[in-house]
């Protein structure tokens, strides 16, 4: 459960794949498609809103126990509108939303090697956006095995002035 | 309940070595970053090394790099520190510790083992 | 590395007073818009335990009279009115980087 409503606080970024593709979003027919691609030189990179909550995790050995903290985020690129996950379509879309935002729109924040962060589905444990063919996806990842691979690393650089939208 | 056990700790003469272990249980071993910390007789505390979950990354303090491996199996549920050339300078109680969820900080600790470089 | 300087080394105060930590960073523990700063609690004999992660918020089981705050360089450990049980060591610690580093601890102990 996500401990508090409000987030105990908010930072202004852009978003990139561990190969420095820039994440971006882009109103098409009246809905935004998100794209992962190489920037040209002087374009500006899209800023996206994260909102973390402080949220418990779930023991393993006992479904209704708690097993410590862990940082969740929401992303929100432009007003109103949130990443969230599709997970009957593996996809990753964006989608106007009101608060109470619902369970899809929230990641579990994994901090990574090489200065990179994973977003796991709240609503699919072990299952992470990744980048496929282009897009963002949701990819099933064996922590055993694949915990490091490159498509769901991403880079967060942050901007420092919180004019959001 | 989420706990962790050392072990291997005790006396040993400088330039030799050890093997910590560190038995876990309670949660799922392999979703979790593990780490060593240690703290010398009437100090403070130091990071020693940290091994991802997936057992992806390793990093080390520089006082111990070439010197000691972390490593994990995660088949036992057991994290290691295999410490060689050891030093006067590395007695201390080695504490296993356990990453949160998404590895933001140390969240659990076991009750530590001591090791003492001594001749 | 980032050094992190906890200010006073010893505390002396009474059960129910108000007691104020101070750890100051070498340089900003902020990443991501977090400030990646922990504290943790030690009593002779026992390993540290977890108070508050990321400047501000407790660990699991953590009583509310421990708070934390502060961002950049410069964080606050307070306990509200202090309980017998509270005379301990407390360390801050950053998670922003490696190495991770800690304070070198302040003491509180019963005046």
């Known amino acids: 459960s996500i401990t508090g409503i409000s987030p105990i606080t908010e930072s202004l970024a852009s978003l990139s794949t561990y190969n420095d593709q820039s994440i971006t979003f882009a109103l098409e027919d009246e809905s935004y498609e998100i794209y992962v691609e190489d920037l040209k030189k002087d374009k500006k990179k899209d800023k996206v809103l994260l909102s973390y909550y402080e949220s418990q995790h779930p023991s393993s050995e006992s479904g209704d126990g708690v097993d410590g903290k862990m940082l969740m985020v929401t992303l929100s690129p432009t007003k109103d509108f949130w990443l969230q996950a599709n997970n009957k379509e593996h996809s990753v879309e964006l989608h106007k939303c009101e608060k109470p935002l619902p369970d899809q729109a929230f990641f579990v924040l994994h901090n990574r090697s090489f200065n990179c962060v994973s977003f796991e589905c709240k609503t699919d444990p072990g299952v992470f956006i990744g980048v496929k063919d282009n897009h963002l996806a949701l990819i099933k990842v064996d922590y055993s095995e694949n915990l490091g691979s490159e498509n769901i690393l991403f880079k967060l650089s942050e901007i420092h002035h919180h004019h959001h939208h | 309940e989420v706990q962790l056990v050392e072990s291997g700790g005790g006396l040993v003469q400088p330039g030799g070595s050890l093997r910590l272990s560190c038995a876990a249980s309670?949660?799922?071993?392999?979703?979790?970053?593990m780490s060593w910390v240690r703290q010398a007789p009437g100090k403070g505390l130091e990071w020693v090394a940290t091994i991802s979950g997936g057992k992806t990354f390793t990093d080390y303090v520089d006082s111990v790099k070439g010197r000691f491996t972390i490593s994990r199996d995660d088949s036992k549920n057991t994290l290691y520190l295999q410490m060689n050339s050891l030093r006067a300078e590395d007695t201390a109680v080695y504490y296993c510790t356990r990453a949160n969820y998404g590895n933001w900080f140390f969240e659990v600790w076991g009750q530590g083992t001591l090791v003492t470089v001594s001749s | 590395e980032i050094v992190l300087t906890q200010s006073p080394a010893t505390l002396s105060l009474s059960p129910g007073e108000r007691a104020t930590l101070s750890c100051r960073a070498s340089?900003?523990?902020?990443?991501?818009?977090?400030?990646?700063l922990n504290w943790f609690q030690q009593k002779p004999g026992q390993p540290p335990r977890l108070l508050i992660f990321a400047a501000s918020n407790r660990g699991s089981g953590i009583p509310a009279r421990f708070s934390g705050s502060g961002s950049g360089t410069d964080f606050t450990l307070t306990i509200s009115s202090l309980e017998p049980e509270d005379f301990a060591v407390y360390y801050c610690?950053?998670?922003?980087?490696?190495?991770?580093?800690f304070g070198q601890g302040t003491k509180v102990e019963i005046k």
């Open positions: 340089e900003s523990v902020a990443k991501y818009g977090l400030s990646l």
């Open positions: 610690q950053q998670s922003k980087e490696v190495p991770f580093t």
């Open positions: 309670g949660f799922t071993f392999s979703s979790f970053s």
